[in-house]
């Protein structure tokens, strides 16, 4: 009763198509699969960035897999062949592991890469990224930004740089068609006559860095003798009402400060007959139904009411 053995996949490699972190892992079937022609061979693939404590694990019948990685760090991957128990009249058989690594050999000391990279997707319409030059780099150093997301044929360079003292310190992106809810990859590299400059890689999803416009058309309505309804409208733009959370700051008679977070465009406030003045401001943020994260908008213009008759909606700026 000979022990059934199977070889690991051949030609296992990590291929970089130039998409700034979106890599292809590919391999060929193992040698000597003739004995298992009736069998569907599977592969167990494990991969991670160097330094990560956990492996991502995939079981597939394909000869390739694609995923995003942090190119600031190395990548390691391993794969073995799996013969299901149906093929072996018993338990599952596994080959030894085939292993490979990938790393973009760096140029330059880490301090030379851009510092404080910050990207904001304004009102879900305009992406703007800004950065500071690396530490100790001279004024002749210039940085260039490249980006890619699924749907682009190849990585594109920024065409509208923000400059300070002749250096690129940011990028205004063009309209980015069908670019949300997928990984958006950025590389900022640099050049200098004086010293090599370290490249820096970033990955995020655009819907998670949205900064909306502030709410507009703030109004008051007297609901009853002791209730006032505060209302506002969503800002102009592509973000639907269902995607907003709001934070309200209410000041009564310059003393009491109430803050509240709500999910729709109204808030009912309990007041006393003694209330002489009421002011409120609102700001908005994309909520958990539409993104995993977001940035609060600026506060709206302040709206105030002074006097007795709220029903007339006397609004004072």
């Amino acid at each position: 009763d000979t022990e059934i053995k199977v070889n690991p996949p051949q030609d296992f490699e990590i291929v970089d198509p130039g998409y700034l972190g979106y890599l292809y892992l590919q391999w060929q079937p193992p040698l000597s699969l003739d004995h298992f022609k009736e069998c569907t061979v599977e592969y167990e693939l494990k991969y991670r960035n160097i330094g990560s404590e956990t492996w991502k694990t995939i079981i597939t019948k394909n000869l390739h897999y694609k995923d995003g990685f942090d190119l600031n760090k190395g990548i390691e991957a391993k794969i073995h062949t799996l013969l299901p128990w149906q093929c072996t009249n018993g338990s599952e058989v596994q080959s030894s592991w085939a292993e490979t690594t990938y790393w973009i050999s760096p140029q330059g000391i880490p301090e030379t890469k851009v510092q404080d990279m910050d990207c904001v997707y304004y009102n879900w319409q305009y992406l703007l990224c800004s950065w500071k030059p690396g530490i100790g780099v001279l004024l002749d150093t210039n940085y260039n930004l490249f980006y890619w997301y699924e749907g682009l044929d190849h990585a594109l360079q920024c065409v509208d740089y923000i400059k300070a003292d002749g250096q690129n310190i940011g990028c205004r992106f063009p309209y980015l068609e069908a670019s949300d809810y997928k990984d958006f990859y950025i590389c900022v590299n640099g050049s200098s006559e004086n010293k090599p400059i370290r490249s820096s890689y970033f990955t995020f999803q655009l819907q998670n860095i949205v900064k909306p416009l502030p709410p507009v058309y703030l109004t008051f309505t007297r609901e009853s003798s002791c209730e006032i309804k505060l209302k506002w409208s969503i800002p102009l733009g592509p973000i639907p009402a269902r995607c907003f959370d709001y934070e309200i700051e209410i000041r009564e008679d310059d003393t009491t400060l109430v803050t509240a977070t709500v999910e729709n465009e109204t808030y009912t406030l309990k007041t006393t007959n003694e209330t002489r003045q009421l002011c409120f401001v609102v700001r908005s943020k994309v909520n958990i139904y539409c993104s995993d994260d977001g940035i609060w908008s600026e506060w709206s213009d302040k709206q105030c009411w002074e006097g007795e008759d709220l029903s007339k909606k006397t609004l004072l700026r």
Partner: antibody, heavy 116, light 108 residues
């Protein structure tokens, strides 16, 4: 397997220069940077400079005026030259491979004595 | 430049004892760029722990590393004879790259 082998003189006279060759095997110089580090009883481990896979260099500012690092990718050799040596340059000089921003393999070291 | 101060300079430990040594940086270092090397007399340094907490190939699991910012440490959960050596911390964050003066670990 990965190896870095150093060759160079053991004794140099003051004001003369030091030349060390680091011959590598098991990897390509087009894919990895090579650093130079020295070790002396008085100053411990000191980083001197690096030649990156693309051929550009970075030097410790304290040595930039008298240090030169170059390489020949086809011969898998890295060349280290330091001028104007003094007694306090007496040390063991190492080449080391850069991987994942650390020095994962080191040469065996070249022991230098600067003395007349 | 970033100065790395290691303490203690010399320490001794018995077999099976837990050992901890520290490395303090004069300014903040990214944990990705803080490494530890082991060196024995007459040999070149060996990469021991990289990026604060990752063990280099062949390093026993009794070793661990931790820390962030300006404070880092290397720990041996149970001292063995072969662990007697000098351990250096190293920052790869800023030029010039620098090393600590080392902690010499002796077997008691």
């Amino acid at each position: 397997q990965v190896q870095l082998k150093q060759s160079g003189p053991g004794l140099v006279q003051p004001s003369q220069s030091l030349s060390i060759t680091c011959t590598v095997s098991g990897f390509s110089l087009t894919s990895y940077g090579v650093h130079w580090v020295r070790q002396s009883p008085g100053k411990g481990l000191e980083w001197l400079g690096v030649i990156w896979s693309g051929g550009s260099t970075d030097y410790n500012a304290a040595f930039i005026s008298r240090l030169s690092i170059s390489k020949d990718n086809s011969k898998s050799q890295v060349f280290f030259k330091m001028n104007s040596l003094q007694a306090n340059d007496t040390a063991i000089y190492y080449c080391a491979r850069d991987r994942y921003d650390a020095f994962d393999y080191w040469g065996q070291g070249t022991t230098l004595t600067v003395s007349s | 430049q970033i100065v790395l101060t290691q303490s203690p300079a010399i320490m001794s430990a018995s077999l099976g004892e837990r050992v901890t040594m520290t490395c303090t940086a004069s300014s903040s270092v990214s944990s990705s760029y803080l490494h530890w090397y082991q060196q024995k007399p007459g040999s070149s340094p060996k990469l021991w722990i990289y990026s604060t907490s990752n063990l280099a190939s062949g390093v026993p699991a009794r070793f661990s590393g931790s820390g962030s910012g300006t404070s880092y440490s290397l720990t041996i959960s149970s001292m063995e004879a072969e662990d007697a050596a000098t351990y250096y911390c190293h920052q790869y964050h800023r030029s010039p790259l620098t090393f600590g003066a080392g902690t010499k670990l002796e077997l008691k």
